[in-house]
Every structure is written in structure tokens, then in C-alpha cells.
Amino acid sequence: RAPRCRELPAQKWWHTGALYRIGDLQAFQGHGAGNLAGLKGRLDYLSSLKVKGLVLGPIHKNQKDDVAQTDLLQIDPNFGSKEDFDSLLQSAKKKSIRVILDLTPNYRGENSWFSTQVDTVATKVKDALEFWLQAGVDGFQVRDIENLKDASSFLAEWQNITKGFSEDRLLIAGTNSSDLQQILSLLESNKDLLLTSSYLSDSGSTGEHTKSLVTQYLNATGNRWCSWSLSQARLLTSFLPAQLLRLYQLMLFTLPGTPVFSYGDEIGLDAAALPGQPMEAPVMLWDESSFPDIPGAVSANMTVKGQSEDPGSLLSLFRRLSDQRSKERSLLHGDFHAFSAGPGLFSYIRHWDQNERFLVVLNFGDVGLSAGLQASDLPASASLPAKADLLLSTQPGREEGSPLELERLKLEPHEGLLLRFPYAA
């Protein structure tokens, strides 16, 4: 008799793909634009990225460092009206994109949480949660929670409000901390909280270090759902050299959990390449005219337009990975097993029951390497075959779809491979 199928886990919408952060509407839209009506016109682009949720804002009224002039229920008129917001929500819903609203109170000020008036602010947040839930948002984000006294208890309360309204609503908390113990203490008291942090931000050095960080995190968090990013708000290029961007895209999309990106991550947007642009929110490069300040500073291959036309671009890779992530059971909710593949490499398997399985091999080093895949590290349920088909490489040119002998696998510098192989009873 055929083995019984494993029962599918309950899947929330944020389990099914990536989240896309637009923290600065004006930088995202550019050209002196930057309002909710303009963002509505960019939803087709978000659809093309196959992201599942848009993390928006903050867009509420906030007079820098002034609690009295901070109103979490009012949209800053520079961004548009409540009607514009409702219209954006409706359009996003039609395109199956969920909208998560950032309610970090003092986003224009020094301390995001007005350190001296925590209770006043917490009450404002509570009221805002109820108001915006009624308005139809799908979730909330609050950042810099290391600046919020008694963050765990506030988060628990806000989580109760959010989940009390609907299990289908999400609360995301962001912290600048990269300390695992601090992260765990925030997670312990909040079961379904999605936490973005700087935990992986110093992982760029070696495959072994990254493997160790990822496996420690997964072991420590047990079977709870994770999110993966390099920070709570900043671009990947703030932490990574250009040659590692593809590798990290592949990793973030194939680890068990929700990948979270900032606008521009999909094209390798880099503030350092745009003189005068703020590190935390450079202008989005839609085309070569997006940054007119310095003629010739932007070439076509840095832009959405240029990369959309290039099947070998970072944007094309992002779209392919996002598509795979949202439709393959093993990547959606499969088990994860990391194993040894040799110095400089990080490799793991994702598998779910009798579905197609995936092998990820990442070369963080700047030399080509043979992968010595140590299948002995793996449980019997996740054993490696002799060959697997190459689904994609982060480097161009490899013949996708062809079978590769895993014993003879070699990776170019900074190359990542995603291979697939069938379940074998």
C-alpha cells in the first residue's frame, strides 16, 4: 500500500511568500511624487514580484518628537487621504496583495517611542489597531521595539487585539538587535509574532558562519514560524557586497519562514551608488530618469526597466525565486535539514512528504569550490539522491533542467544552486 499522505499544516497568507516593505513612499515613487494614489499605480509591479504582502509606511501624522501632534488615526495629508488609503486597500485586495500598516509612532523623531510617555503612546497604538483593523488592513508593523519599555507585554496586548479581530491578521515587530537571547525573549511571550531583526546582518563572511546562525536560530525557535531578513528596515546592500546579493536572495526565499524584503532589494538598489541619497531610503530606480541629480550616474542595468528586460538580472532571479517559493509545497512548509558540504559552503534540503524536494547549495567564498555533500548528516527521511536536476543558479548560463551528479558538484565563486529531485519511497 502507498504510504499515507502527511497532513498539511494550517497555512496563513504570510506563510505563502514574501513581504515587501515600502517605508518611504516618496523615495519609492520618486519624481517628487510619493502618495497613496501613486502607490496604487505600482501594485501591478508588486504583483509581478509575486509578493504576498506590502508593509507600508508609517504614513500617519507625526510632528517630530511631539506626542500631542502625533495622530495614528490620521494619514499625513502629504501622503493622501483616508479615501486614497481605502482605494489602495481595495485595489491591493483585488490583486491578492495584503496591506500591513507600520504604526511606529515617532517615525520622524529621535526616539521612535517617545521614551518619556510610553503609556500615552501605548494607548494611542491600541486605539489605532482597532481603528485600522476596522478599516480593513491585514496587519501591523512596529519597529525599534528595543526602545519600547516593557515591549514584551505591550506586544502581547497588541497581538491579542490583532488576533482577536481575526486569526488572519498579522503583527510584525522590528528590532535592531542581533542578539539571539534578546530576540528569543521577545518571541517567548508572543506566539504568533513575526519578528524582523539584524540577526543575520553579520552573516556575510562565510558559509559556515551563516549555517551556524541559521541552524542556531531554527533550533532555538523550535517549530514556530520565522521571518528572514537582514534588518528591520534597511536594504540588503547596506550589509552585503553586490556579489552576495543573489546568494542571499536564494537563501532568504528557501529558508523555512517568511522572507521580508525592502523596496529595491529586488534590483540591488544601493544608496552608496547614488550620491546625496539617504542610506535608509534612497530613491527607487524605475528607469534611468529616476535619479536626475547626476547625469549618467544611473545605467539601465541598475533600474527596474533595464532589469525587467534582462533574464539574467537580479530582478529576474527575484521573480523566479518568489514564484517557486509560493507554489512548491517543500518550500512553502517543508522540513529543513542543513548538512556539511565543505568549507565556505552552506547547504540544506527542504522536503515535504512525497512532494518534490529541493537542495540548496551556497558558496559564500570568492573561489570556486567542489561541494563535498555529506549525506551522512541527514536523517533517512531526507536522504540525498545520486543526481538532482538544476532548477536555477544565481549565476547565468548553467543549463537549467539538466541532471547533475551531486558527487561532482562544483560552484563558482559566490554561486548558489537550487536543485530539485523527486521523492523516493
Epitope: 536536476d389 548560463g397 543549463e399 560552484l411 563558482e412
Partner: antibody, heavy 124, light 113 residues
Framework: QVQLQQSGPELVRPGVSVKISCKSS????????VHWVRQSRAMSLEWIGI????????DYNQQFKGKATMTVDKSSSTVYMELARLTSEDSAIYFC?????????????????WGQGTSVTVSS | DIVMTQSPSSLAISVGQKVTMSCKSS????????????LAWYQQKPGQSPKLLLY???TRESGVPDRFIGSGSGTDFTLIISSVQAEDLADYFC?????????FGGGTKLEIK
């Protein structure tokens, strides 16, 4: 020596389907994927898709999805391609080819061995 | 998809002469990671299937005479036959092997005067 032997020419009516074959010999069949390429007067050479002889996984060129269906029979080292709902625009020579330029433990889309081609003529 | 454009579409040349044909791609075929350009050239004699001549722009397939020379980088590529022989009468196709789907140029027909 490496050989890819294709089935003979086909003359078919519009609207029907045809299945052509490509039998490999002279190498370890499941070590290499097989590609199909179409050559017509109008469009030069067009890549149709690739089939993994190891797993049977297929990747089609978007333009040929719904038109071409590839299958593999490992026991006879043969790959098949069925072309559906044929029109005069499908009249062409269809080649199977092996991707074989090995570099860094992988292959590249440079095709080192080709079948002799199967002529498909669609005419009423 | 990457579009490949070849020129000229045909040319007639005498035996012993040098011939140059061009191939342009709509996107760069250079992988900056390994500095290789992912371009191949094929020769197709009348009534035969294509035969691989060069890949990675200039790497000769075994058995290909050294009169066939490939060059170029990025989007502009050239195939030179340094001294044309009678048996070189054929169509020549360039093909990018940089990304899926691989795409071919329209071909250059070489005729012998």
C-alpha cells in the same frame, strides 16, 4: 560514439497531433538532458524546451507551452515530443540535441550533439 | 527573451579569403563573476543538422579547425574564418547560452564564389 537518432518525416493534416522520437546511444543516457529545437524558414532556430532524462522534469520555452509535450522512456533511452493542434506554421524540421559543454560540474546551453532532424509538414 | 541579430544575412567569398560575420545580442552576455561571455557559434551545411563550432565566445569544440576564430564581449560578437575553404559553405548561427530560453540569431549564409 554518441548518436541521437530521430524518427522519420511526417506529413499531417491541420488540427491533428504528431509524436516524434529521439533515441540516444553511445553515452550514459541519464547523465545528460535532451533539448528540442525547431528550424523553420520563417523563424530560424527556436529552442522548444529541455527534458531531464534522469527525473522526467521538463522546462518549456513559454512560446511552446500547450503546443509541445515531452516525455522520456529510460528503458529504451528515448525521448519523445508530441506536437498538438498542428497548423501550417508548425511545418518545420524538429531537432533533438544534447547539451554537453561541461563547466563547473554543470552543462551549458551549447549543444554538442544533434539528431538528424525530423521534418514535419502540415498540409490539407 | 534575449534577441540575437546576425549580419550580413548572406555573403559570397572566394576560397582563401578571410570572412567576418557579426552577431549582436539585446543584452550583455558577460558573466562578470567569471568574465566569460556566453555565446556559441554553429555551422549548418545544406541538408545537415547544426554543428557546434565555438562556445564561451572563443572556445573551440574539439575537431574544429583553428581557422575559425571567435571574439567579442558584452553584446557584440564576431566569427572570423581566417582562410575560407570550399567545405565551409554553410549557414552560420550564433546562440546565447547565457539565460533561459537560449536564443539563436537568424543566420549568415556563406556562399563560395
Amino acid at each position: 560514439q554518441v548518436q541521437l537518432q530521430q524518427s522519420g518525416p511526417e506529413l499531417v493534416r491541420p488540427g491533428v497531433s504528431v509524436k516524434i522520437s529521439c533515441k540516444s546511444s553511445g553515452y550514459a543516457f541519464t547523465d545528460y538532458a535532451v533539448h528540442w529545437v525547431r528550424q523553420s524558414r520563417a523563424m530560424s532556430l527556436e529552442w522548444i524546451g529541455i527534458i531531464s532524462t534522469y527525473s522526467g522534469n521538463i522546462d518549456y520555452n513559454q512560446q511552446f507551452k500547450g503546443k509541445a509535450t515531452m516525455t522520456v522512456d529510460k528503458s529504451s533511452s528515448t525521448v519523445y515530443m508530441e506536437l498538438a493542434r498542428l497548423t501550417s506554421e508548425d511545418s518545420a524540421i524538429y531537432f533533438c540535441a544534447r547539451g554537453g559543454r561541461h563547466y563547473y560540474g554543470s552543462y551549458y546551453y551549447a549543444f554538442d550533439y544533434w539528431g538528424q532532424g525530423t521534418s514535419v509538414t502540415v498540409s490539407s | 527573451d534575449i534577441v540575437m541579430t546576425q549580419s550580413p544575412s548572406s555573403l559570397a567569398i572566394s576560397v582563401g579569403q578571410k570572412v567576418t560575420m557579426s552577431c549582436k545580442s539585446s543584452q550583455s552576455l558577460l558573466n562578470r563573476n567569471n568574465q566569460k561571455n556566453y555565446l556559441a557559434w554553429y555551422q549548418q551545411k545544406p541538408g545537415q543538422s547544426p554543428k557546434l563550432l565555438l562556445y564561451f565566445t572563443s572556445t573551440r569544440e574539439s575537431g574544429v579547425p583553428d581557422r575559425f576564430i571567435g571574439s567579442g564581449s558584452g553584446t557584440d560578437f564576431t566569427l572570423i574564418i581566417s582562410s575560407v575553404q570550399a567545405e565551409d559553405l554553410a549557414d552560420y548561427f550564433c546562440q546565447q547560452h547565457y539565460s533561459t530560453p537560449p536564443t539563436f540569431g537568424g543566420g549568415t549564409k556563406l556562399e563560395i564564389k
